[in-house]
């Protein structure tokens, strides 16, 4: 899987959206899951509705929320109140049984706000951020991960 | 008129099968998520399982007490919705109801049920 | 699974009064609450949705209010119509109601 990076504001939302085969993963329910280290688990964050018929409902966990259009096979997370602790790596997840597949690796970055004259220090920018995909919603912008490219910050 | 009537209730024996029927007039069916309910005599609501409309692919969905016994199923060009007992158990006497799903849009609805037929009464008892 | 619990049980009023029902979840469930009337051997009639909305045909007497965990039904003006059991709804989880809530006119 590629990595899809979706860059946000601090302060504002994000909406990160994968899009899937609807037939494929007809039935099941999907998440939104945070990658704990380059190699560790993806620790759920959010699911959508118990029931597949009732996937369209937004469901929240704190300040993330999840949406499936199950017609149109788009899945839509919206982070509100983006934070820098809200930068890293995460996966768009179709659910079966006790498995899950994943439809989308996704990096979050998060932009320091043009309009906060605070310190920005403790926001993290990879590396490579001058080449982007023109995928913008709400105050997103989506790119794929460039070859190469760490989708982890270093560690000090 | 927009209306549901179910058929098909009685006295069984446990362990044995009850279909039961929800006909529908007035309005276009197959745009429609149809649920089944229960109440038990004297007793609260319970929601049994519903099955989407045309658009979901008659997709289904149950109460875990009954997941694997009850079966719902549709047929569009009669407007019915049927209800599927089998290995019924006498805690499943109740009066059953079938209910409209209330529609948003050609995809969106919401779990309020705008619609109910009247009830059909099954016993279940040696 | 959430829980819904319903409050009062059992109510008497007289004809003209307010009066007040209360549900509450077990955990917050957004706005996803509906509310019914359920009469003696009728089926159950569907009066509020989303927590706030009126369904059509329902006499403005009829509210509904709240969100997250704490949810409220009112009848602003009792009539003698109005005797029944009254029942929320959530759909946040699965499809569970509450208890119900018997008025009675005194």
């Known amino acids: 899987h590629n990595t899809t990076v979706f860059q946000g504001v601090a302060g504002q939302s994000l909406q990160v959206s994968c899009p899937y085969d609807s037939m494929k993963h007809w039935g099941r329910r999907k998440a939104w899951c945070r990658q704990l280290g380059e190699k560790g688990p993806c620790q759920r964050v959010v699911s959508t509705h118990n029931l597949w018929l009732l996937s369209f409902l937004r469901r929240w966990n704190g300040s993330t929320a999840i949406t499936d259009d199950t017609l149109g096979g788009t899945l839509t997370i919206t982070l509100r109140n983006l934070q820098p602790h809200d930068a890293g790596l995460y996966q768009c997840q179709s659910l079966h049984g006790s498995e899950a597949d994943t439809l989308r690796k996704v990096l979050v970055e998060v932009l320091a706000d043009p309009l906060d004259h605070r310190d920005a220090g403790d926001l993290w920018f990879p590396g490579e951020s001058e080449s982007f995909e023109d995928a913008h919603v709400e105050h997103s912008i989506s790119r794929s991960l460039l070859e190469g490219e760490i989708p982890f910050p270093p560690t000090s | 008129e927009v209306q549901l009537v179910e058929s098909g209730g009685g006295l069984v024996q446990p362990g044995r099968s009850l279909r039961l029927s929800c006909t529908a007039s007035g309005f276009t069916f197959d745009d429609y998520t149809m649920s089944w309910f229960r109440q038990a005599p004297g007793k609260g609501l319970e929601w049994v399982g519903f099955i989407g409309s045309k658009a979901y692919s008659a997709t289904t969905e149950y109460t875990a007490s009954v997941k694997g016994r009850f079966t719902i199923s549709r047929d569009g060009s009669k407007s019915i919705a049927y209800l599927q007992m089998n290995s019924l158990k006498t805690e499943d006497t109740a009066v059953y109801y079938c209910?409209?799903?209330?529609?948003?849009?050609?995809?969106?609805?919401?779990?309020?049920?705008?619609?109910w037929g009247q009830g059909t009464l099954v016993t279940v008892s040696s | 699974d959430i829980q819904m619990t319903q409050s009062p049980s059992s109510l008497s009023a007289s004809v003209g009064d307010r009066v007040t029902i209360t549900c509450q979840a077990s955990?917050?469930?957004?706005?996803?609450l509906n509310w019914y009337q359920q009469k003696p051997g009728k089926a159950p009639k569907l009066l509020i949705y989303d927590a706030s909305n009126l369904e059509t045909g329902v006499p403005s007497r009829f509210s509904g209010s709240g969100s997250g965990t704490d949810f409220t039904f009112t009848i602003s003006s009792l009539q003698p119509e109005d005797i029944a059991t009254y029942y929320c709804?959530?759909?946040?989880?699965?499809?569970?109601f509450g208890g119900g809530t018997k008025v009675e006119i005194k």
């Open positions: 709804q959530e759909y946040d989880s699965y499809i569970t």
């Open positions: 955990q917050d469930i957004t706005n996803y």
């Open positions: 209910a409209r799903g209330k529609r948003y849009s050609y995809t969106y609805w919401t779990p309020a049920f705008d619609v």
